[in-house]
């Protein structure tokens, strides 16, 4: 027989997901001026663009680039200058050093004298000329220019102990998710950092095997739950004249300096105007600070009339992070994202005080994110369109107006293709770019400020379009359901040939940490979608209470109890899923990785018979082997005073008992900086005691995100076996 | 200054209608969300129902919820509260009041419109 | 619902004397409490809100104290204008219903 024209199209292999086959780009200008963008070719030059008059030229050479092996490149403001950066050697989550040369544009050759040292741990030039501040070995030194000797500003620095200008484990992963704590003034005449003292910080110490004879031992500073904490002050240098004053320390607020406390970030207003943010360590109370430079004093004075404080009564302040404020031209007013009176997150305008804050948007939806304010609009991103949450699109408000009138920029550009957009402005917004993450295949385009129209189409992913056009992809849908009173919003994918009167074998895919999202509207070729492509199984991924945009009163349920409602939740769709008659009860899976882990091992450990089999990647077991920052934010102290009992309660390990019916495979890398392997080990530790059988896998030398190609495949390779196993899938 | 100046008042019998008007001034009206809270003769403050001021989400305490309708004009700068199918027990001052922007606190007040409801 | 009781319903002060007012909540309130006047006649006045925050023109005479389920106004010296009703209102969720406690009656002795 022969197949018909239809047939033709061939089933993802798990091949094609390991080898990336059909991985998609974006395209995000680096902006440097209002009509002026630099970008990467394929070809790895660095083309300078002007949208205005259309001239495109090669401002850096790929051989200049491969002629250091430079990956990443900085223009100078003054455009006389271009760091190029090699040797790029990964630390934590967002934390590198890497070798940096500089480049004269001038000279088309590279400075030579003074040349920096390495590795270095960050580097940035000032908003304005070719300052150069970077951090070597825990300080901070400042170029006046990148041919001049470099000035040391810090000398406090000291591995493992004082870090000035960089984050420490913790600040860095839970609390500013940067590389750097340093910021220019907008003049570029005053540098901001902040110093972290990890002194009496509790040491994770853990092997690293390598090839040696006898393994390493990495020891990080890591305040697990209730432990000591980071100390952090603010100081700020006048880089002018660095050697005159010194460093200046900025005040902490009374109202928080009166108990242990976070600096959250820090936000330049104007050249002499700087506002920071603090955070109590019970994180419900936020303070933000706007303090001014007093020439006299050669201070920085921050009164208690600019403090503005944020508070949640039913949860935690701020979303993941409390909020950073986008001020106006005034340098004294500004826009703010926070929960309204109904518990949405909504845009809000501080003229004086934030009793009298003017609420810019609202709604049973939420405002997530304001890109940019300029003389007359705000832009923002918010899931309000059609009521689904796990979309975004652009919204541009005219502050001019009163009331202020509001545009959606985005919602019917390519409404089935697009309906995840994040967006990239130039410094007044004259232009931006458009990513959109799907549902449809990404695309980037380019438009005008004024008047949103599309200029040009930065990239629209046509090879990978073409490359699928013989793929047999599943179908996704997005959907909600009902339970008592609460909504659920889920994806589910659905193998290619699905018909509704067959059985499928379900497998729930779990993150469900709180402010997480999971059912968003974006294009992926992954894992899961070749399970549902290539194995016929039906994936669905449902937000349960506790992740985000969706308000408080759903944000907050899990707060001060994680590891109750998330896993209820993700039992209630189990079933709902089941009612819908195409799901063979016999067959349901979950798996999840970290937060997903945790709740994938709980909901395995419900003792509700609903799973066959379920697998747990670097899961946390217990909230008090986490970091402070996180496990606190959540359910307060592991103390008899406050909340040690949840902490008990919560853990994988008091469930032990309640694996014995069901199949479980426990993986994780033993150089896992962030859940460290302490976590699977007492899971494996307690499953010993109780006697109960399980499976598991750890990957030797490798952090978090199991990410190296080897250990990558062998790890989705094995998760497959057990999957298809379990499933009674034949190979 | 903050002023609201409530009217409307007067005397109904049990089932009929009647609508309670507040004209507001002082403030940017359309910012800030407003409230109708009530006083029986010789009795305590009770909370009747609430408009946000952006977004218009109404709210009404159990007592009136399905007879009352809450509702604002911003153009007019008035807030309103439409009654029907009063009941005796309806009989009170009537204020109209300003929330605060961040909290449901009342920061100004009207000086109020009586409401009799009787056979 | 979170009910709020004030005590006493009636309290007989002379000008001069210091008067203290309770309200205790059902629940836990935070510190999310305001305090009103209402004089004989007249429309309730805001005095403190957030448990301790005077409101705008209030005199330093009026103070507020208290968190989570029992709160108190203080009037230290007692004014011949200050003889009225004074009631305490939650707001602890800003989703209604607020409440407001049954009052208490400050009079001339």
């Known amino acids: 027989l022969r197949p018909s024209r239809g047939n033709t199209k061939r089933a993802l292999t798990l091949k094609d997901i390991l080898n990336g086959t059909f991985s998609y780009k974006t395209y995000f200008p680096n902006w440097i001026s209002e009509q002026e963008y630099l970008h990467q070719s394929e070809d790895d030059n660095i083309v300078f663009y002007n949208i205005e008059t259309r001239e495109s030229y090669i401002i850096l050479s790929n051989s200049t680039m491969k002629s250091v092996n430079a990956t990443d490149y900085g223009l100078s403001p003054d455009r006389q200058f271009v760091y190029l950066e090699s040797d790029y050697s990964k630390l934590w989550r967002y934390s590198y050093t890497a070798t940096y040369y500089i480049y004269d544009l001038q000279n088309g050759e590279f400075v030579r004298g003074y040349e920096l040292p390495r590795p270095i741990q960050y580097l940035c030039w000032s908003p304005v000329g070719s300052k150069l501040a970077y951090v070597y070995q825990n300080n901070i030194y400042l170029k006046q220019r990148p041919g001049d000797p470099p000035f040391q500003i810090t000398y406090t620095g000291r591995e493992n102990r004082i870090f000035n200008g960089i984050p420490d484990w913790v600040y860095e992963e839970e609390m500013l998710a940067t590389k750097y704590a340093l910021w220019w003034s907008p003049d570029g005449k005053f540098l901001a950092y902040v110093e972290f003292n990890d002194s009496d910080i509790p040491i994770i110490a853990y092997s690293y095997y390598g090839d040696g004879q006898y393994p390493r031992t990495i020891n990080i500073p890591y305040p697990k739950a209730g432990a000591k904490n980071p100390v952090v002050r603010v100081f700020i240098v006048d880089t002018t004249y660095p050697h005159h004053v010194g460093p200046m320390e900025v005040p902490v607020p009374e109202m928080i300096a009166s108990s242990d406390y976070y600096f959250s970030w820090l936000t330049w207003v104007s050249s002499e105007r700087v506002c920071l943010q603090w955070l109590k360590r019970v994180q419900n109370v936020s303070v933000l600070s706007i303090c001014d430079f007093r020439e006299d004093w050669h201070a920085w004075e921050c009164p208690k009339n600019q403090e503005h404080v944020e508070e949640s009564r039913t949860g935690w302040a701020g979303g993941f992070f409390v909020s950073t404020p986008a001020f106006s031209q005034d340098a004294t007013s500004y826009y703010k994202i926070f929960s309204d009176k109904d518990g949405y997150k909504h845009i809000h305008y501080i003229k004086d005080t934030v009793e009298n804050a003017i609420q810019i948007t609202s709604g049973k939806w939420e405002a997530i994110y304001i890109f940019r304010v300029t003389q007359d609009s705000l832009f923002y991103s918010s899931n309000e369109f059609e009521g689904y949450p796990g979309r975004r699109n652009i919204y541009r408000i005219s502050i001019g107006n009163s009331p202020p009138s509001k545009k959606c920029v985005t919602c019917h550009l390519r409404k089935e293709r697009c309906q995840y957009y994040t967006a990239s402005f130039s410094y007044k917004a004259k232009y931006y770019a458009l990513v959109c993450y799907g549902p449809g295949l990404p695309i980037s385009t380019l438009h005008d400020g004024r008047t949103d129209q599309e200029i040009q189409v930065l990239e629209e992913n046509k090879e990978l379009e073409n490359s699928l056009r013989n793929i047999q992809l599943p179908k996704v849908e997005i959907k909600k359901l009902k339970d008592g009173g609460l909504t659920f919003w889920y994806k589910m994918i659905l193998p290619p040939q699905f018909d509704r009167s067959k059985k499928y074998p379900l497998l729930i895919q779990v993150y469900g940490g709180p402010c997480s999202q999971s059912v968003k509207s974006v294009f992926a070729v992954n894992w899961i979608t070749y399970l549902a492509s290539k194995e016929g199984i039906v994936i669905a991924l449902v937000d349960g209470r506790g992740t985000a945009f969706q308000g408080d009163k759903f944000l907050h349920a899990v707060y001060r109890k994680l590891g109750v409602y998330e896993v209820e939740d993700q039992l209630t769709a189990v079933r709902k899923f089941i009612e819908m008659g195409f799901i063979d009860e016999e067959r349901i899976a979950i798996w999840g990785w970290s937060y997903g882990g945790y709740v994938s091992s709980l909901a395995l450990a419900s003792g509700t018979g609903l799973f066959k089999c379920g697998i747990a990647v670097a899961p946390v077991s217990s909230w008090e082997y986490y970091a402070s920052i996180y496990s606190e934010r959540f359910m307060g102290l592991p103390t008899k005073d406050d909340n040690l009992e949840h902490y008990k309660n919560s853990t994988v390990m008091a469930r032990a008992e309640y694996f014995r019916n069901v199949d479980y495979l426990l993986i994780h890398g033993t150089a896992d900086d962030n859940v460290h392997f302490q976590n699977s080990a007492q899971i494996a530790k307690a499953l010993v005691n109780a006697q109960v059988d399980f499976q598991a896998m750890w990957y030797s030398d490798q952090n978090h995100g199991i990410s190296s190609g080897r250990s990558q495949n062998h790890l989705y390779t094995h998760m497959t076996h057990f999957l298809k196993q379990c499933f009674s899938l034949s190979d | 200054d903050v002023q609201l100046v409530e009217s409307g008042g007067g005397v109904v019998r049990p089932g009929e209608s009647l609508t309670l008007s507040c004209a507001a001034s002082g403030f940017t009206f359309s910012n800030y969300d407003m409230g109708w809270v009530r006083q029986a003769p010789g009795e305590g403050l009770e909370w009747v129902s609430g408009?946000?001021?952006?977004?218009?989400?109404?709210y009404y305490a159990d007592s009136v919820k399905g007879r009352f309708t809450i509702s604002r004009d911003s153009s007019k700068n008035t807030l309103y509260l439409q009654m029907n199918s009063l009941r005796a027990e309806d009989t009170a001052v009537y204020y109209c009041a300003k929330e605060n922007n961040r909290h449901s606190f009342f920061e100004y007040w009207g000086l109020g419109t009586l409401v009799t409801v009787s056979s | 619902e979170i009910v709020l009781t004030q005590s006493p319903g009636t309290l007989s002060l002379s000008p001069g004397e210091r008067a203290t007012l309770s309200c205790r909540a059902s629940q836990s309130v935070g510190h999310y409490l305001a305090w009103y006047q209402q004089k004989p006649g007249q429309a309730p006045r805001l005095l403190i809100y957030?448990?301790?925050n005077r409101a705008i023109d209030i005199p330093d005479r009026f103070s507020g104290s208290g968190s989570g389920t029992e709160f108190t106004l203080t009037i230290s010296r007692l004014e011949p204008e200050d003889f009225a009703v004074y009631y305490c209102q939650q707001y602890y969720n800003n989703w209604p219903p607020l409440t407001f406690g049954g009052g208490t009656k400050v009079e001339i002795k």
């Open positions: 957030d448990a301790s």
């Open positions: 408009i946000r001021g952006r977004g218009g989400s109404t």
